[in-house]
């Protein structure tokens, strides 16, 4: 019996087609992805093959203005239109709190939404009961397939799930649910979830009875043969993990942003043994036409976005200096504003010992592309912010050793004075450079804001200590020559859309007046 698994993950609000790098589509003939194109391919496969499941491994939420405006209603609407069979909850599904998940998505989705390792407690337990499930048994042709969901246990540090959801260890939570499916005589089981490739592999290795793992969160690109676009494969598709008891378990993921449709064919015998598995992600490029009815629907929903772009988010009473002449040479108040917004967006998980889990931000000056003039009645719009941050990136959370941070700050000024983009803007950091010294030895003082303290204060950076830092995904991926960050980071979790972070902060503050205050000397 053959099953075709179609899968997406980390789509992050890319409802419309995008450019090859998943930013805004400029030249339509070169654009990729989008739900209209995805629907064409899915329907083509559904017509050609008998047993097809369309699955999503989480993080549909967050990433473009679509989510900012529609807050998840767009996810439910278009996933329903594409007739997804199941979805696992990702960490970003909690970005607008539990209410922001329940109302727009859980109550509106016509497909099961799954997570076995999220347990509701207190008043939320009855409110959310039945709206998401640990597993679902789906009829496929003459057979049944069990889908069991999971979500990153780091979600409380990455999003806003509140205090009434407990995120358990994935493996501990999955095993009893898989055992339950086994007692129900379900012998074909897919683990669908959002914890990253390393955890996906661990689930394949440790959770007895799981036949296939369909994952997300780490934006992992797997491919067998010559890859069709710019993404470099992290391994073969499917990636085969040998479980502790000797089962050969295919693990798949389909990069991100709806650029690819994962396509996996699994052959089962009558006992549910996986006899063979093969496939590859399908690049959703312009050779696949956009479905006209879905495209028309997208265009209808688009109208509200254009209106939103010009609405006032808040006001500034000072000039927001985002000029390259400032931000690539010295501390600029636009850099301070953005870093403050980045930290504010990550205010969560305080306890008796920590006022927050993260206090530091770094931001390449070259990523700030425009100033905002306060003389336009002080008005700040989404459109203004899109000019400042035009690349459609995310502000991510990483863990780095102090020694890596020191290298990053040396790199920041290694060729100072040439208007290059690597000059770092900061938050929660005081750095002093001596530019008379030779490159690689110019950082003379580096103090960082404590987190394990009731009154935040600046302490000298410790080389062997591990620090959490918020930074653009561009830097986490080694952009602007920050290879040391990419090579030495100990953990990397993707965060929220850059413009969305700043716009939320401005809306919250209502009136802003960031200053140059001696963070960089």
């Amino acid at each position: 019996w053959e099953l075709t698994i179609l899968h997406t993950n980390d789509v992050h609000s890319r409802l419309e087609q995008t450019s090859e790098d998943s930013s805004k589509c400029v030249n339509a003939s070169r654009c990729m992805g989008g739900v209209a194109r995805l629907f064409t391919k899915v329907q083509q496969i559904r017509r050609a093959e008998p047993n097809v499941l369309l699955l999503d491994a989480g993080d549909q939420y967050q990433g473009t203005i679509w989510f900012t405006v529609y807050k998840g209603a767009e996810v439910a609407h278009f996933m329903n239109a594409l007739r997804y069979d199941a979805m696992a909850l990702g960490n970003h599904e909690f970005d607008n709190g539990v209410e922001g998940l329940i109302e727009p998505l859980l109550k509106e989705a016509k497909f099961p939404i799954l997570s076995a390792n999220i347990k509701a407690k207190g008043p939320l337990a009855s409110q959310i009961s039945g709206l998401y499930l640990p597993y679902k048994v789906l009829p496929v042709g003459d057979e049944v397939v069990g889908i069991v969901g999971y979500t990153s246990k780091e979600t409380p540090f990455l999003s806003n799930p509140g205090t009434n959801l407990v995120f358990e260890d994935e493996i501990t939570a999955l095993q009893p649910e898989v055992d339950k499916l086994k007692t129900l005589n379900v012998n074909k089981i897919i683990a669908l979830g959002h914890s990253g490739f390393e955890t996906d592999k661990l689930i394949a290795q440790k959770v007895r009875g799981v036949d296939v793992v369909v994952g997300g969160h780490s934006n992992t690109f797997l491919y067998t043969g010559n890859p069709p676009s710019k993404e470099v494969p992290a391994g073969k598709y499917p990636f085969i993990v040998t479980s502790d008891d000797g089962r050969k378990v295919p693990v798949v993921q389909a990069y991100a942003f709806g650029k690819y449709l994962g396509y996996l064919k699994i052959e089962f015998d009558e006992r549910g043994n996986v006899i063979s598995s093969h496939g590859n992600p399908i690049l959703l490029n312009s050779s696949i036409p956009e479905d006209p009815s879905i495209k028309a629907d997208i265009n209808k929903w688009r109208i509200k976005l254009d209106n939103y772009s010009t609405q006032e988010l808040g006001k500034t009473i000072v000039y927001l200096d985002g000029s390259s002449q400032s931000c690539r040479f010295r501390e600029c108040n636009m850099g301070n504003l953005i870093c403050d917004a980045m930290i504010n967006n990550n205010l969560r998980h305080a306890d008796e010992m920590f006022w927050n889990h993260v206090s530091m931000c770094i931001l390449n000056g070259g990523g700030i592309r425009s100033p905002i003039d306060e003389r336009n009645n002080g008005t700040i719009t989404w459109e203004n912010l899109a000019a400042v941050l035009p690349f459609g990136g995310t502000f991510d959370l990483v863990q780095l050793k102090g020694s890596t941070l020191k290298k990053a700050f040396e790199h920041s000024v290694h060729r100072y004075g040439q208007s290059t983009g690597e000059f770092l803007q900061v938050g929660g950091i005081h750095v002093v450079y001596d530019l008379s010294r030779k490159p690689g030895d110019r950082v003379v003082k580096l103090d960082v804001l404590c987190t394990k303290c009731r009154v935040p204060s600046y302490d000298p950076l410790k080389m062997d200590e591990i620090y959490k830092v918020i930074l653009p995904n561009f830097l986490a991926n080694g952009g602007d020559g920050f290879q040391m960050i990419k090579d030495e980071l100990l953990r990397h979790d993707s965060g929220d859309q850059d413009i969305n972070v700043v716009s939320t902060y401005i809306s919250k503050m209502k009136v802003i007046y960031p200053a140059v205050e001696g963070r960089i000397k």
Epitope: K182, I240, D245, G246, K248, E267, R271, N273, I275, S276
Partner: antibody, heavy 119, light 107 residues
Framework: QVQFQQSGAELARPGASVKLSCKAS????????IQWVKQRPGQGLEWIGA????????RYTQKFKGRATLTADTSSSTAYMQLSSLASEDSAVYYC????????????WGAGTTVTVSS | DIQMTQTTSSLSASLGDRVTISCRAS??????LNWYQQKPDGTVKLLIH???RLHSGVPSRFSGSGSGTDYSLTISNLEQEDIATYFC?????????FGGGTKLEIK
Amino acid sequence: QVQFQQSGAELARPGASVKLSCKASGYTFTGYWIQWVKQRPGQGLEWIGAIYPGDDDTRYTQKFKGRATLTADTSSSTAYMQLSSLASEDSAVYYCARGNWDDWDFDVWGAGTTVTVSS
Amino acid sequence: DIQMTQTTSSLSASLGDRVTISCRASQDISNYLNWYQQKPDGTVKLLIHYTSRLHSGVPSRFSGSGSGTDYSLTISNLEQEDIATYFCQQGDTLPWTFGGGTKLEIK
């Protein structure tokens, strides 16, 4: 239907080696583990080890590590077990069987090969 | 390694009898218990997997039960062709291990 054809009886001297074969038919050879089981006369069954022909992954019980070598030839759908440094206690019937990994049961068995170790 | 113990090494019963053969594991094996029949000619067949699931083609007079460490195989209406030795095997943890066997004879 699924079947295993095992090689004929072997007579070997102590210290010698034997190589037993098990030819599979009626199923996808590369999709299942082949298990090897020993039974001494009048005794119970003892698991030796297993091979997954799809990638030549092997597992052995501690007692047979280093002395049993499992191999598989996918072109002929045949699994082999070589047993070296034979002693009288290796005189037994050796079975190959197909392993189901949902419950790790052995659902189809060969008829067995008798090995006699004698000087 | 998990030890599998079949305390009764041989059992006599009459045709038509209900016969129960037991098997004990040295630790919890989470229902991953399989039963085999070995005929006097050496032929081995799977009867039951995962404690109670009848393998295809096996007569319905065979049934299995148990949990944790204690398991049993029942033949509800003994027939002549059931004369054989019965082995249990755990599929919970490598290495897979078998019980010593229970030989069933006719009274």
